[in-house]
């Protein structure tokens, strides 16, 4: 059994171990226990062998389970006495009744047990433990009282423990030997003095935490144990615990407020105040950061820090920015010389830091303000814009010139420059919304960008944008089209120079629109023809003048075509129109369908004035009879040397009609051989008859032509066989077969066609065509109408 006296406290459990060694008997040993109170004999207490061994007093306690034997090995046992009482103080003897056959050594051993009254008082035991509500960084202390009135020299040990849910942690312990032991995770805080354990008076033990952390939340217990020294060894005689308090760490209230909307003039100072509201009044230190974002969301990338006041009150800021504080609750951001780039959203970010152990700091609260929307208003340049048209088109293709003038009253300084944008808006035809089209826009660096409408025409040089004076911007359309008609306006932008030498647009001023318009009336072209000498005879010169007038045609030039409408013998057929001679807008003459080789120089067309033309036809013939007209086309200049047809008009007709009682000629065909055999001679007569005035045969001449529609091609056009002109010259067409042709005048009015050695191809229908020529009184030959 243990050699030292065992000391226990009333109500605790007494456990005495006993073991036997160096024996020869059975391996499982039996043990008897006896008890002797001071000065009395031993009384049987319990046995592992003999059921009837215990005295009556102990039988009941054994049955109740207050006393029991627990075998721990074959050679060892423990005596357990629960709820030990003062009457249990005395000597306990353990013996082995059946170890060896012969006595060899010590078969019993005795240990003294002292039972002390419970003189350990631990508190507070009154009331359930209080709940301490505090904030992170705040101090707290807990007290536990422990006192022992033991007559023996005992030491107390104390442990502070915190429970958080199922987890249990040791905070700080004071051992019975007077040593402090910080729990796991509390070492640093203990060594820095943040967590301390000390005594107050003779029996109070104080746990002090100078800076509460969120991890300090939980239920705190004070565990007190009482120790006694027996023969140089310390043994714990009892332990008591008490719930002291529940610590709740409340989150700190922290709010940062900035003005919602602020307007500041360009170049002035922006002064924003961040007001802090907090329930912390202890030695927490604020860290204030002002940041800026283009968007009303401080979490988005692109947010940048402008200034920061750290917890040591040191300011870190960017140029033109200052941060100051009037008091611990008000922080000013000052941005000097603001410009447009300072427009945006400003945030105040506040962190509260509480001092921790070893000069460390920990954040106890954090807040970000709502954004302060800052708008930078301009010290606007004061100017007006006037647009006027220095050239207004009267017609399509005329030039248009617009001048956009800046009348600037207060913006002469070097840090303001002007640029222009030109816009076009179609004339409204209805209530439909008509959007403006950008023609050109000038950037702050005066680079010009064209709109879709004007890109190509600007590249072609038709649209010209220029700046001819410091205060005037010009826009020229070289050739204005009908599509260009509409409203034009200019927008002059003022640009302000920034600190970084960039230019930022500060104002736009719109001109009133200028309407470019001309009446799109139809072009009118009127041509009047007249005959200066209305009466003339065949052989005389025919003269006709054409006078042209026009409206709504710009810078017209005229081209003229003389045309004749000649009657055809068959009344059911339309008249035949012949183009005779023309004169283009550059006064170049061209013979059209004038085919009379003998009269190549017989027609003349000339420009008398810009709007008057004269046609002359020399040595007129009866065959020239007909209706004569001028067809006039008006042309407008386009792009320099090019011309655009503007209108065409026909003059009234001038008639050439020879009123004569001259002869009437007829022609007929006769053949003596209407049926022939191949190889025979075919004889065909063209006989002319003259009615009316008798003519001298010398005053008559004829052009005679023979045609045939051969039997092998009755559906074909007639084929010219041979002709004899009025001067007696015979012309014969080439033939693909062997027969020959001859044509001769056999009398004044008879012409004979002979086919020699006729072949099958010569069979068919033959006819003659006669053009009479009659000598006029003036001696000129007049061509008569062709007869068949």
């Amino acid at each position: 059994v243990p050699t030292a006296t065992l000391v226990r406290v009333v109500g605790t459990e007494l456990v005495i171990p006993c073991n036997v060694s160096d024996y020869d008997g059975p391996s499982e040993q039996n043990f008897d226990w006896s008890f002797s109170s001071l000065g009395s004999s031993f009384v049987e207490l319990a046995s592992t062998w003999e059921v009837g061994f215990p005295a009556q007093l102990y039988q009941e306690r054994l049955q109740r389970g207050e006393i029991l034997l627990r075998r721990t090995a074959n050679d060892a046992v423990e005596l357990h006495i629960k709820n030990v009482q003062p009457s249990d103080q005395g000597h306990y003897k353990c013996s082995t009744p059946s170890t060896d056959a012969t006595v060899q050594g010590n078969y019993e051993d005795t240990v003294q047990v002292k039972v002390l009254a419970d003189s350990l008082h631990v508190g507070p035991s009154a009331r359930p433990p209080p709940s301490l509500s505090l904030r992170e960084g705040e101090p707290f202390e807990l007290r536990c009282t422990a006192a022992s009135a033991s007559p023996l020299h005992t030491h107390l040990a104390l442990l502070w423990e915190v429970h958080r849910g199922p987890a249990r942690r040791s905070v700080l312990a004071l051992t019975h030997e007077g040593r402090f032991h910080p729990g796991l995770g509390y070492e640093q805080r203990y060594h820095s003095g943040d967590v301390r354990l000390d005594t107050v008076g003779s029996d109070a033990y104080r746990l002090s935490v100078s800076r509460a952390l969120s991890a300090d939340q939980g239920s705190y217990r004070c565990i007190v144990s009482e120790w006694i020294a027996e023969q140089g060894n310390w043994q714990e005689i009892q332990e008591k615990a008490v719930e002291v308090a529940t610590v709740v760490i409340q989150p700190s209230v922290l709010r940062a407020a900035v003005p919602k909307n602020v307007s500041v003039a360009e170049g002035k100072e922006l002064d924003l105040t961040c007001n802090i509201t907090t329930d912390r009044a202890d030695d927490v230190r604020p860290e204030v950061t002002w940041s800026f974002s283009r968007m009303p969301d401080s979490t988005l990338p692109g947010s940048r820090v402008l200034a920061r006041l750290d917890r040591d009150s040191l300011v870190h800021s960017s140029p033109h920015v200052a941060l100051s504080h009037v008091d611990a609750r008000s922080y000013h951001l000052l941005v000097r010389d603001v410009s447009k780039e300072n427009s945006g959203y400003y945030y105040c970010h506040v962190s509260l830091w509480a001092p921790g152990h070893n000069r460390s700091w920990h954040k106890v609260a954090e807040a970000v303000s709502s954004p302060a929307g800052v708008g930078v208003t301009w010290l606007e340049p004061d100017y007006q814009v006037y647009l006027n048209a220095s050239k207004v088109p009267g017609f399509a293709d005329d030039p248009t010139e617009l001048a956009c003038r800046v009348v600037d009253t207060k913006s002469g300084e070097a840090n303001v420059r002007f640029t222009v944008s030109w816009y076009y808006r179609m004339n409204r035809r209805s209530d439909n919304v008509v959007t403006s089209e950008l023609l050109a826009v000038m950037d702050g660096d005066w680079t010009l960008k064209y709109g879709e409408r004007s890109k190509q025409r600007a590249q072609d040089g038709d649209f010209i944008f220029s700046k001819e004076h410091t205060d005037t911007f010009n826009f020229r359309i070289q050739r204005t089209t009908e599509e260009d008609r509409g409203n034009y306006y200019c927008v002059v932008s003022a640009w302000t120079k920034q600190r970084n030498n960039s230019w930022v647009k500060s104002k736009d001023v719109f001109s009133k629109p200028v309407n470019i318009f001309w009446a799109l009336e139809d072009s009118v072209l009127v041509v009047k023809a007249r005959q200066p000498k209305p009466f003339f005879a065949a052989g005389n010169t025919f003269e006709m003048t054409c006078k042209v007038s026009s409206k709504n045609i710009k810078s017209p030039r005229y081209s003229v075509l003389i045309m004749a409408e000649k009657p055809v013998g068959d009344l059911s057929s339309p008249n035949e129109t012949k183009y005779i001679i023309s004169l283009d807008q550059d006064s170049v003459v061209k013979l059209e369908n004038w085919t009379d080789a003998s009269r190549v120089d017989g027609v003349v067309l000339e420009k008398v004035q810009e709007d008057e033309f004269r046609y002359r036809m020399y040595q007129t013939q009866v065959s020239d009879a007909g209706l004569y007209r001028c067809m006039v086309t008006a042309w407008s200049p386009v792009r320099g040397s090019l011309w655009r047809e503007a209108a065409t008009s026909l003059s009234n007709p001038i008639e050439i009609d020879f009123q004569t009682s001259g002869p009437i000629f007829n022609a007929s065909v006769h053949s003596d051989t209407p049926s022939v055999i191949r190889g025979d001679l075919i004889k065909l007569f063209c006989i002319i008859t003259v009615e009316g005035a008798a003519l001298d045969p010398d005053d008559m001449a004829f052009d005679v032509s023979w045609f045939a529609v051969h039997s092998f091609g009755l559906d074909k056009a007639p084929v010219l066989l041979s002709s004899l002109d009025r001067k007696g010259i015979v012309t014969t067409s080439r033939r693909d077969w062997k027969s020959d042709l001859s044509l001769e005048r056999v009398s004044v009015l008879e012409f004979l066609l002979q086919v020699h050695g006729s072949e099958d191809q010569d069979f068919g229908n033959y006819y003659c065509s006669v053009t009479p020529w009659v000598k006029s009184p003036t001696g000129s030959w007049q061509k008569e109408a062709e007869i068949h």
Partner: antibody, heavy 118, light 113 residues
Framework: QLQLQESGPGLVKPSETLSLTCTVS??????????WDWIRQPPGKGLEWIGT???????YYNPSLKSRVTISVDTSKNQFSLKLNSVTAADTAVYYC??????????WGQGTLVTVSS | DVVMTQSPLSLPVTLGQPASISCRSS???????????LNWFQQRPGQSPRRLIY???NRDSGVPDRFSGSGSGTDFTLKISRVEAEDVGIYYC??????????FGQGTKLEIK
């Protein structure tokens, strides 16, 4: 038989400090089993708990009065005290001291009326 | 803080008749240790309060057995089986489960009809 007796001035001027002492007889104030409390009752009104102290020095106060209250203990004299500063007419009341155990407030003093008036 | 609300605030009773006072708490008074720390006090005219009941239903020594307490969670009741003349006064409930602060009800005045 445990007895508690309040003592102190019955009249206090506004803005001054109200000071009361509770003397405990028939038992030790240094018992680990008890808290020592102060309660007040304005005339014609209900009871309001002010605060408590444990002999080891732990104090707990009503948050509504915390900034103005101090409770202390003198174990050698078996007394505990109340100090309430910056008083106003609203602090006029009968002030009671009491013993608190795990079952509540079992013993009360007979109370003392403190009037705040200039 | 836990708010204690008593009803009725005034209770006129005929001698010999039963009386019942209700006390309701703003949160449960069950402590983590399983106990409910609720007291009932009697304050006779011109006297200090005297504890009648502790831990909801336990009568203090010397308190007549006509007084009984009951309830759980947030609803508690003090019953007087037969009212006697000496029972006249103001009755208060008090909780010390969740403290600080210890809180009282506003009081119920019992008077004889």
């Amino acid at each position: 038989q445990l007895q508690l007796q309040e003592s102190g001035p019955g009249l206090v001027k506004p803005s001054e400090t109200l000071s009361l002492t509770c003397t405990v007889s028939g038992g030790s104030i240094s018992s680990s089993s008890y808290y020592w409390d102060w309660i007040r009752q304005p005339p014609g009104k209900g009871l309001e708990w002010i605060g408590t102290i444990y002999y080891g020095g732990s104090t707990y106060y009503n948050p509504s009065l915390k900034s103005r209250v101090t409770i202390s203990v003198d174990t050698s004299k078996n007394q505990f005290s109340l100090k309430l500063n910056s008083v106003t007419a609203a602090d006029t009341a009968v002030y009671y001291c009491a013993r608190g155990n795990s079952y509540g407030l079992d013993y009360w003093g007979q109370g003392t009326l403190v009037t705040v008036s200039s | 803080d836990v708010v204690m609300t008593q009803s009725p605030l005034s209770l006129p009773v005929t001698l010999g008749q039963p009386a019942s006072i209700s006390c309701r708490s703003s949160q449960s008074l069950v402590h983590s240790d399983g106990n409910m720390y609720l007291n009932w006090f009697q304050q006779r005219p011109g006297q200090s309060p005297r504890r009648l009941i502790y831990k909801v239903s336990n009568r203090d020594s010397g308190v007549p057995d006509r007084f009984s307490g009951s309830g759980s969670g947030t609803d508690f009741t003090l019953k007087i089986s037969r009212v006697e003349a000496e029972d006249v006064g103001i009755y208060y409930c008090m909780q010390s489960t969740h403290w600080p602060p210890v809180t009282f009800g506003q009081g119920t005045k019992l008077e004889i009809k």
